[in-house]
Every structure is written in C-alpha cells, then in structure tokens.
Interface confidence: medium
Amino acid sequence: KSPIFGPQEVSSIEGDSVSITCYYPDTSVNRHTRKYWCRQGASGMCTTLISSNGYLSKEYSGRANLINFPENNTFVINIEQLTQDDTGSYKCGLGTSNRGLSFDVSLEVSQVPELPSDTHVYTKDIGRNVTIECPFKRENAPSKKSLCKKTNQSCELVIDSTEKVNPSYIGRAKLFMKGTDLTVFYVNISHLTHNDAGLYICQAGEGPSADKKNVDLQVLAPEPELLYKDLRSSVTFECDLGREVANEAKYLCRMNKETCDVIINTLGKRDPDFEGRILITPKDDNGRFSVLITGLRKEDAGHYQCGAHSSGLPQEGWPIQTWQLFVNEESTIPNRRSVVKGVTGGSVAIACPYNPKESSSLKYWCRWEGDGNGHCPVLVGTQAQVQEEYEGRLALFDQPGNGTYTVILNQLTTEDAGFYWCLTNGDSRWRTTIELQVAEATREPNLEVTPQNATAVLGETFTVSCHYPCKFYSQEKYWCKWSNKGCHILPSHDEGARQSSVSCDQSSQLVSMTLNPVSKEDEGWYWCGVKQGQTYGETTAIYIAVEERTRGSSHVNPTDANARAKVALEEEVVDSSISEKENKAIPNPGPFANEREIQNVGDQAQENRASGDAGSADGQSRSSSSKHHHHHH
C-alpha cells in the first residue's frame, strides 16, 4: 500500500481554482526527491503536468504551481482557471519516474450553474441555519409574505405570514420582521439538511404587483480535513461545532458504508476497540471539544465525523465536522509490545519510546481511566513526583538521547492491571498505550531480599542481600534508593562477574548493600534490580526502618537528604569496607510551575511547556556490592 495520501475526490467549478495537498512519510529521501502531478490516460500511462524539478506542461502554463513543504512532509499543487477539460483522474506522487509512490486523485470540474440574474446565493454547512432576507415595497406591507421552494413544476410553500408551515419545516422555519422596518421580512431555517438545498422564491403580495426574490440555497457537507498519522502514533480530532450546540452531548463516529458508528460520546458510550486508548475532552463553553486516540492501528484509518446532539448519536440536520485519517505503516515509532504481563508481587519494566530529537522533553506515565469521558492522571514524570499511592514501587528512568525511557512498577497487585500511556510534553504523536495484565503468582519471585523485615539500628552496620537466580548471572545487578523523584542507583561493583565460572550455584548468587553507619536518613524504600545496558529488568523492593539503639518507636522520615555511607562487600569484615565519598547531589528545585496542569492528560499534556532536567538523583550516596560463590573443577 502506497504511503502517499491526499484528497480522493476534488470537485470545483469552471473558472475557479483548486489547491491539492499530498502527504508523504517523514524521511530525508522523501523530502528531497522529485514530487509530481500527472494525469492518467486510458492506457494507464500517467503524463506529467508539473513536477518539483521545474517541469511545467503547456496546458498548465501560467496557471499552476507545485510547492514542496519538507517541514510538513507535504507538497501542494495549485491549479487556476479550471475548465471542464480538467476533469479526470490524476496522481500526486514521489520518485524519479511516474511509477513511483503515488495517490489517486479524481478531479471533477462542473459548469457554473445557470441562475436567474437577480438570484441571491446562500452557502451553508449541514446542520447550520440560514436567514433569508426578503425585501418588498411599502405598498405590499399589509399583504401576505411567503417563502416557497421550487420543484420541477411548481413552488411548494415552506412558510407564510399566516403561520402555515410545510410539515418538513415544522420547528425549523420562522418568518419574522425586525423592529419597525416595513420593507424586509426574514425567513430563518435551522438544522439544514441536503434536502433543503435548492431554489426558493420569497414573495410579498399577490398578482403582478407582488415583490419576488430568487434565492439559491447551497447546503454543503463539510470537506473532510486530511490527517496523516504514523502507525502506533496518536491523533487528535479538534472539533469546533459552534456555540449553538455547546450544551448538547458530543460524539465522534467512524463512517461504515451508510452509517456512522459512534466510537465515543460524552454520555459514556465507547467502542471496545478503542478501550484504553481514547479520551474525549471538552475544550470550552463554545462547543469545542477534542478526541485523542493513541496507539493507532492500520484498521483505524477511515472517515471520521464529530457532531453534537442530545442523544450523543449522529442526527440529520445537526452540525458536523469530518476527517479522513490515513495511517502510514512506514512508521518512525518503534514497534513495542502493546501488552506487558506481570504477576502479583512481581514487577514490570516498561520501555516508553519518545522522539529522539526531543531528548530534553519531560517524560510522563499516566493511567488511563475509562470513567466519564476518560482521563489519564499522571502517576510519575521527570518532574512530576510519584503519586502517593505508588510510594516505593514506581519510578521513571530517563535515558537521554536513545529515544527510550523506562517506567518500573513493582509490588504488583491485580488492581494494577489496566491501560497506561507513555507521553512527553514534546511531540504528541509519540504517545503510546500499554496494557498491563497482572496474573496471580504461581511460583517464588526471581529476586528475594533478606532479611525481609528490615529494621536497621541507628549508628550500627546493616546489610541486606538480594538473591537472584543463575539466569540473571550475566546481567548487571544494582541497588537503588527510592524517592518520589526517582530511584537513585547506588554505585556498585560486581566481584563475581570478573571471575571465570564453570557452574552456577543457584543458592549463592547475591548482591548486597551495607549501610555503615546507619543514619536516620537511610530510612525508606530500596530496590534491588537487574539490567542489561540500558534495558531494565526485574526489581524487588524493601522498606528499611531505622530505630534508636534503645529500640524506641520507629519514626518514618520522608526527607531524603544527602547521607554518608560506608560499604561492605558481602562476607568481608566490616572494617575493610570501602569508604565512599559523600555525594553532594544538588536536589532539583523543580521549575515545574504548571505541575497541576500536567497531572491529567485529559487536558493535553503536550501543551505544558515547563522545562528542566530529570530530578532522579535524590542525593543519596550508597554503594552496593555483588559476591558470587564459584565451584572450581
């Protein structure tokens, strides 16, 4: 399937102009290659009419141009002074020959309709209303006023001043006069449909002295706006229906042959195909709203329509807006697992892609909630502190420059199952959706910490060990101290990794962390985890409480100041421990002024422009070590 996209059908009238936009995938080659517009002949040949190389055919001379917009990945073909001879099948495309990637466009140029010379033309969109102005002479002021619609043979009454109304206009047509002006009457017709289009005659008085006026009412279906989006990216449908429907229920539907199937509405209806990846957000009191869909699939391509009606369903005669969505399968967004599976008590590490050109953008992770119109409250971000209910078990690791950040959630419960979104305050196309499934654990976790009830005594030495299976032997093990700004990885060195090993003793693989001497600031959550390069794996968490020597009551200190620590390698005497320098990490003051704005993605997180560095270093200075026991043969 060609990744080029444009309008399928373009219709215009003689003497008028058209501007046709064609979209192409965002690659350097595409931006620089030849763009063309050619006309398809009966033989299947496509004859170039204009190209970006400067070619212009004789029949387009002086009336057409082609402009490339590499920054938008589009090119535009402008054609003026259209004639009926321009009606036909065309292609807009890319490539050195006209057999390259292309999109078929049908252009129809019709004759200007013949109208009586005094005809007033009103052009309105479906669902809107029109007020027709009907002037008359003073002598006809006392006479009957009327509006009729011309049919083949006669003129069928719409409404008159004696309050006669055609059944199909009941509740939609009003005849009135303004103030003391006795030379004009008005007819307002609301909830316009295609059937209302046509010629009308306003009349005041009867017989030869009657005042008559011809009116041509054109009722247009909205021209679909073209949306070109990458597979797995996101799209926002911005719907602006006007103040007159501000209080009506809103919907977005997708055309399916003759019907339009509702995908989401403000009354709580939602298509199961879009579960976890759609939000509808009211914008203001003027009837504006937006629908955001993430994780675009091939099958999402199609014709969409938004509208408003008390039923939350499409209704003839109500305003609509339409889009044609094209999903480009040559996506720049990497193909990642859309379903992540975890077990109760275990952990998941979710790799979130972002636009590598925007490595300094703020990264977020939110949980999609389907109640109401759907919303996505932020749980963690590079400058958004972890939500309280996720204390000690959620952290975001930013890896600047490689187009990925990682979110780790541990101590999983079945309630964590659901949909989560990766997003940044940068390129909104890179929003991705992950479904987290949590099953009941059927075996022991891979990582286990001992002792499990960890209470350290102030001023003494305290060691915790993290046991891991042989399958993690070659992976990097780490301990980190959790804070609501991230999990600060403690410096470590892996003794066993430097030794040759013939076999692996399942019972003796461990990485230890020693606090020496224990201070009050050491209280809190610690994680033991494994990773391979920048790819994070499993984690387990432990809360270390700190008590006075007197065994007094334990006091949880939420602050996370810099602390001094000495580190002991597992199974070595404490006195030979390596003394770490104090780590004076400067806590980030957090210039995230608009923090509240970003906490709910229902309000378009990418609009938040706060900037700053990730506040993941929490100022702790700790070290951990790994010791492996080997059997030498």
Epitope: D16, S17, S19, N65, F69, V76, E80, T123, Q218, L220
Partner: nanobody, 127 residues
Framework: QVQLVESGGGLVQAGGSLRLSCAAS????????MGWFRQAPGKERDLVAV????????SYADSVKGRFTIARDNANARLYLEMTSLKPEDTAIYYC????????????????????WGQGTQVTVSS
C-alpha cells in the same frame, strides 16, 4: 503554518472608507489562498471575500459586491481589503484567514475551509 496579523480597523461614519491590511509571516505566502471574514456580535463568522494563491481569482459575498475589493501582494506577504461606501451593518470584527487546501466553488464561502486565522480587527460604522 502561516501567522497572520490584521490592522487598519477603526471607527468610521456611514458612507466612509477603510483599508484593512493583513501581514503574513512564515513560508510561501504565495501558496496560500486567502480570505477576509467578519463576525458581528451574536452572529456566525461569514466570508466577505477570497483571493486565490496567485491573485488570479476573487470572490465576494453578495452584501459587499461593488463596495469591497480584496487584493494581495505576494512579494511583501500582505493581504488587503479596500472597503468603501460603508454601512452600519458592516460593523464587525474582521478576520484574515489562510488555507492551502482549496476546492473552490461554493466551498470558498466556508470558514471551515480555512486553517490559519488572525486575531481580528474591529470595524465600527456609525450612522
């Protein structure tokens, strides 16, 4: 996208004249079809006049035909609306608008066809 800034609005007596100007910034002004729209209080935004990308085609609302003239200067990225014989019913906020997608015909008269808008300039015609 093109950015648009209108100027030239003000208070004028019925029968008087005004010239509105719209300055465009951004790339390739000459590839955009341009329009002037107006919105009176409590009314919807209505098209006043449009001009195609090259200036070769113009179109006017019936209510302003013969009184208003739309023109463009592609070299300086400017759009103009010359308004003469002004009437009190011309009172409104006037907006400059641009679009690249354009299928001509009656569709030229629809605000929905235009994707870039200025902030507007107030024109008040007193009787």
């Amino acid at each position: 996208q093109v950015q648009l800034v209108e100027s030239g609005g003000g208070l004028v007596q019925a029968g008087g004249s005004l010239r509105l100007s719209c300055a465009a910034s951004g790339r390739s002004f000459s590839s955009y079809n341009m329009g002037w729209f107006r919105q009176a209080p409590g009314k919807e935004r209505d098209l006043v006049a449009v001009v195609t990308w090259s200036g070769g085609g113009t179109s006017y609302a019936d209510s302003v035909k013969g009184r208003f003239t739309i023109a463009r200067d592609n070299a300086n990225a400017r759009l103009y609306l010359e308004m003469t014989s002004l009437k009190p019913e011309d009172t409104a906020i006037y907006y400059c608008a641009a679009t690249q997608d354009w299928y001509g015909g009656t569709r030229a008269f629809r605000a929905a066809s235009f994707h870039s808008w200025g902030q507007g300039t107030q024109v008040t015609v007193s009787s």
